[in-house]
């Protein structure tokens, strides 16, 4: 496990709960002390660890960006789960931001898939049925975006 990019805690916390490492590793929700003797609890709502580890620092909780909604909060064992707001989506190519879904398909195409938090609307050619990607130069019909149900954790 390699952890390089962790951000600062916002405030000091009281002494964390401790336990002993098992075979040099600490359980989820903890990090190891620098002398290797103790497992120190992560701080709820501030940092976390998801696996057995020898991290010297717990991982910093993600804060949902504007344009995202928090589906579940950060716990000591799980990062925050954020999802794009209704009418926006996060592409695999650019996961750092939510983009607005298109409101309709180009001429000669029909909508076969709704806007979801992880994908734009899906358009296919009326005749061939082949998919179209990219911005629509013209809109034939207005599509009401509908939010999807699955969520993805923030990266």
């Amino acid at each position: 496990i390699t952890q390089q990019d962790l951000a600062p805690q916002q405030r000091a916390a009281p002494q964390q709960k401790r336990s002993s490492p098992s075979e040099g590793l600490c359980p989820p929700g903890h990090h190891i002390s620098e002398d290797g003797r103790d497992c120190i609890s992560c701080k709820y709502g501030q940092d976390y660890s998801t696996h057995w580890n020898d991290l010297l620092f717990c991982l910093r909780c993600t804060r949902c960006d504007s344009g995202e909604v928090e589906l579940s909060p950060c716990t000591t064992t799980r990062n925050t789960v954020c999802q794009c707001e209704e009418g926006t989506f996060r592409e695999e190519d650019s996961p750092e931001m939510c983009r607005k879904c298109r409101t309709g398909c180009p001429r000669g195409m029909v909508k076969v898939g709704d806007c979801t938090p992880w994908s734009d609307i899906e358009c296919v050619h009326k005749e061939s049925g082949t998919k179209h990607s990219g911005e629509a130069p013209a809109v034939e019909e207005t599509v009401t975006s509908s939010p999807g149900t699955p969520a993805s954790p923030c990266s």
Epitope: I1, T2, Q3, Q4, L6, A7, P8, Q9, Q10, R11, A12, A13, Q15, G24, L25, I32, E34, D35, G36, R37, N53, D54, L55, L56, F57, R60
Partner: antibody, heavy 117, light 108 residues
Framework: EVQLLESGGGLVQPGGSLRLSCAAS????????MSWVRQAPGKGLEWVSA????????YYADSVKGRFTISRDNSKNTLYLQMNSLRAEDTAVYYC??????????WGQGTLVTVSS | EIVLTQSPGTLSLSPGERATLSCRAS???????LAWYQQKPGQAPRLLIY???SRATGIPDRFSGSGSGTDFTLTISRLEPEDFAVYYC?????????FGQGTKVEIK
């Protein structure tokens, strides 16, 4: 008595590589997190990298990320810092230090790395 | 990252006087993760104080540390000739560990 002894420093051209070593004794090396800290001539202290006791977790300063690699051989009680793509601004005395978070309680004598053409 | 700002940059005092060095953090730091070091020319730093107020092994009791949150202080109650040096604070609350820029205590 805890002792940390660095070696491997020297003069290297920009873009070149060096590997620093730190031989540790006087404590249970494999239990402790270790760090490298550097000090440019006439400047203050800058933490460079750290590694957990088992070697499973590593940490780097942004200034060296992707160029430097910290590692350890617990069977030899030795800490390493592999430095690639060296730049003039990497010129410094490099110290091996015991600890990371609660203070560096023991330091080596330092080894000078000079990056110059 | 947490930025530590030390003041003053230089402190000019005479032996026997009291030295008060300040370290201010840009974000709150747990007392457990605040340390102070002394460094003399040509030497490696030496740990003086860890956990904001605990003296390291072999450190004379004229050195003391205090503070919490974002404000920490190193006090040398009566300066001895060997105390003239540069002093650094350091935090390990969150990565990367960072040092203050240092305070030089020089002979007046």
């Amino acid at each position: 008595e805890v002792q940390l002894l660095e070696s491997g420093g020297g003069l290297v051209q920009p873009g070149g590589s060096l590997r620093l070593s730190c031989a540790a004794s006087g404590f249970t090396f494999s239990s402790y997190a270790m760090s490298w800290v550097r000090q440019a001539p006439g400047k203050g202290l800058e933490w460079v990298s750290a590694i957990s006791g088992s070697g499973g977790s590593t940490y780097y300063a942004d200034s060296v990320k992707g160029r430097f690699t910290i590692s350890r051989d617990n069977s030899k009680n030795t800490l390493y810092l592999q430095m690639n793509s060296l730049r003039a601004e990497d010129t410094a005395v490099y110290y091996c230090a015991k600890g990371v978070r609660k203070g560096f309680d023991y330091w080596g004598q330092g080894t000078l790395v000079t990056v110059s053409s | 990252e947490i930025v530590l700002t030390q003041s003053p940059g230089t402190l000019s005092l005479s032996p026997g006087e009291r030295a008060t060095l300040s370290c201010r953090a840009s974000q709150s730091v747990s007392s457990s993760y605040l340390a102070w070091y002394q460094q003399k020319p040509g030497q490696a730093p030496r740990l003086l104080i860890y956990g904001a107020s605990s003296r390291a092994t072999g450190i004379p009791d004229r050195f003391s540390g205090s503070g919490s949150g974002t404000d920490f202080t190193l006090t040398i109650s009566r300066l001895e000739p060997e105390d003239f040096a540069v002093y650094y604070c350091q935090q390990g609350e969150s990565p990367p560990p960072t040092f203050g820029q240092g305070t030089k205590v020089e002979i007046k």
